[in-house]
Interface confidence: low
């Protein structure tokens, strides 16, 4: 939905076009409960609370109201070169029985948080991927967002600042480090099946072989690249299902923890591998505790309800020092009907080899 704040002479100073999903934890008499709901289509800008700001006293704010007393507020600020949603706040009324059935208290609660929504002055902020803002007991996820404050001509600028999540992430193998010590190449890793289930059934099915490609400095100051296979027989799998995030956590030998995070683009209904985190121990390394993470990947993409399949080896670069080689991957996230893989979307590598 589009939300606009105008000043006294009718010129727009804030324009925002987004959909939003709310996840709220609250107490009922029978214990804690989580409710998820979307910003309804009849949500409106509260004109007497929203503001274009005053030169010396306040900054622009967008206040959106819906339901029985819920308001979402975006407070903007700027410096010399950039503006941002410095603070997002959400007021919710637990007496709204449509949204919060059986709430044990009927109070009005307010939560707030800083955000990473920011853009260059005279550019719009654009984020197709979900932007999550975590507050106390509440998570707000903005989808397919276009936002701009401090407008100069009552319309979105042509130029845009893209959010971190939308920026492309290379999925090629990392470049070889300067003259690393050679490392014996292990065989291809064994392929294993993984599944993650939640209260609504299976949210992740995966079949793949996993190999870690690690570059690190040894105690003798030499740089080495090692390939480590994840052995399914020595790996415990767990995970979690969420409306916008599905995780697969693998605990393997050598105190290795490998975490995969799958995200979903609601506007295009596609899932993708969004993040990888690794914690492991390398006994011969100068710093034995090896940690790496990247939460803005774009790999293994397919339409929700379909599966992604690739027989060719895929290299997913996580950091300069760490990539994951994925063998014979077949994966489906979020929507898995009957515990079976859906229609297959082949990777480009396979299509090119056909």
């Amino acid at each position: 939905a589009m939300f606009i704040v105008k000043n006294g002479n009718g010129t727009a100073c804030i324009m925002a076009n987004f959909s939003a999903a709310f996840s709220v934890n609250y107490d009922t008499k029978s214990g804690p409960k989580n409710m998820t709901f979307d910003l309804p289509s009849d949500a409106k800008v509260v004109l007497n609370s929203s503001s274009c700001g005053k030169e010396n006293t306040s900054d622009p704010s967008l206040v959106i109201a819906f339901g029985r007393g819920q308001t979402l507020t975006l407070n903007f600020t700027r410096n010399a070169t950039r503006y941002s949603v410095q603070l997002m706040s959400f007021v919710y009324n637990l007496s709204d029985t449509h949204l919060f059935p059986n709430a044990s208290s009927k109070e009005i609660k307010t939560v707030e948080s800083i955000t990473d929504i920011r853009a260059d002055i005279d550019k719009k902020y654009r984020c197709v991927s979900g932007t999550q803002v975590h507050m106390n007991n509440v998570t707000v996820t903005l989808h397919d967002a276009t936002i701009q404050a401090y407008l100069s001509n009552s319309s979105f600028s042509r130029e845009e600042t893209r959010c971190e999540q939308d920026r492309p992430s290379p999925t090629t193998a990392p470049p070889a480090p300067p003259s690393p010590s050679p490392s014996p190449v292990p065989e291809s890793p064994s392929v294993d099946k993984y599944n993650v289930s939640g209260t609504n059934g299976t949210c992740l099915l995966a079949s793949m072989g996993l190999q870690l490609n690690l570059t690190y400095e040894r105690k003798d100051n030499t740089t080495v690249t090692r390939l480590l296979n994840i052995n399914p027989n020595k790996t415990l799998a767990s995970g979690s299902c969420g409306a916008h995030l599905v995780t697969l956590e693998l605990h393997s030998e050598g105190s290795t923890v490998l975490l995969f995070q799958f995200g979903m683009n609601a506007s295009s209904s596609r899932f993708f591998l969004q993040g990888i985190q690794l914690n492991t121990t390398l006994p011969d390394a100068r710093d034995p505790a090896f940690k790496a993470a990247n939460s803005s990947l774009r790999a293994l993409q397919a339409t929700v309800g379909n599966s992604y399949k690739c027989n060719a080896e895929e290299h997913v670069r996580v950091t300069k020092a760490f990539s994951v080689n994925i063998f014979k991957v077949w994966v489906q996230a979020f929507k898995v009907e009957g515990g079976q893989f859906g229609s297959v979307e082949e990777c480009l590598l396979d299509e090119n080899n056909m």
Partner: antibody, heavy 122, light 111 residues
């Protein structure tokens, strides 16, 4: 009350890495940015950057971008800074501090940890 | 990067007198009527402490002896009257743009 408890002093060799922690208590961790500031012996203060625990994204002073990695663990309300490829120039006290948003009056660092001293010596 | 120049580098003031510290920015730290300049106190062996935010606003719990003023590029920090407990180094800091920068500090001593 708000408290930022930093990890103990570190002694490291040149070329090594160190990882320091800053455990926050007394407030909602994800509602504020966590900043890191460096102070060399007898010198002034240098801003390294901050981590936003809500979104998981860091923002770096370009001067420190290749030297430091800022992270956080929301489950334990703890922020981390890792210094890589240590040299004698990295010998300093490193402070974590909370970024507080004063509405239109901007951000300032309203609470500070006690600092972690890093000594790089062969 | 915005450079903040503090003066004097050190200052000796008698108890009960006024101490004044200046901070000059290489470019304006005002925008839209807001000033992104703050002042901190650091006592020997301790962490910095926020005293003044946004040029002139006293942080909660800070005595009214401390005050700040200024806009644009020129700022002043004042302690009146000075007490023995005020022996410390005082820093100005801007965050109108990244990277945030601090002044070089002013060391306050008692005469």
């Amino acid at each position: 009350q708000v408290q930022l408890q930093q990890s103990a002093a570190e002694l490291a060799r040149p070329g090594a890495s160190v990882k320091m922690s800053c455990k926050a208590s007394g407030y909602t961790f994800t509602s504020y940015t966590m900043h890191w500031v460096k102070q060399r012996p007898g010198q002034g203060l240098e801003w390294i950057g901050y981590f936003n625990p809500s979104s998981g994204y860091p923002e770096y002073n370009q001067k420190f971008k290749d030297k430091t990695t800022l992270t956080a663990d929301k489950s334990s309300n703890t922020a981390f800074i890792q210094l890589n490829s240590l040299t004698s120039e990295d010998s300093a006290v490193y402070y974590c501090s909370r970024g507080y948003y004063y509405g239109s009056r901007g951000y300032a660092l309203d609470f500070w940890g006690q600092g972690t001293s890093v000594t790089v010596s062969s | 990067n915005i450079v903040l120049t503090q003066s004097p580098a050190s200052l000796a003031v008698s108890l009960g007198q006024r101490a004044t510290i200046s901070c000059r920015a290489s470019e304006s730290v005002d925008i839209n009527g807001n000033t992104f300049m703050h002042w901190y106190q650091q006592k020997p062996g301790q962490s910095p402490k926020l005293l003044i935010y946004a040029a002139s606003n006293l942080e909660s719990g800070v005595p009214a002896r401390f005050s700040g003023s200024g806009s644009g590029t020129d700022f002043t920090f004042t302690i009146d009257p000075v007490e023995a407990d005020d022996v410390a180094t005082y820093y100005c800091q801007q965050n109108i743009e990244d990277p945030w920068t601090f002044g070089g500090g002013t060391k306050l001593e008692i005469k």
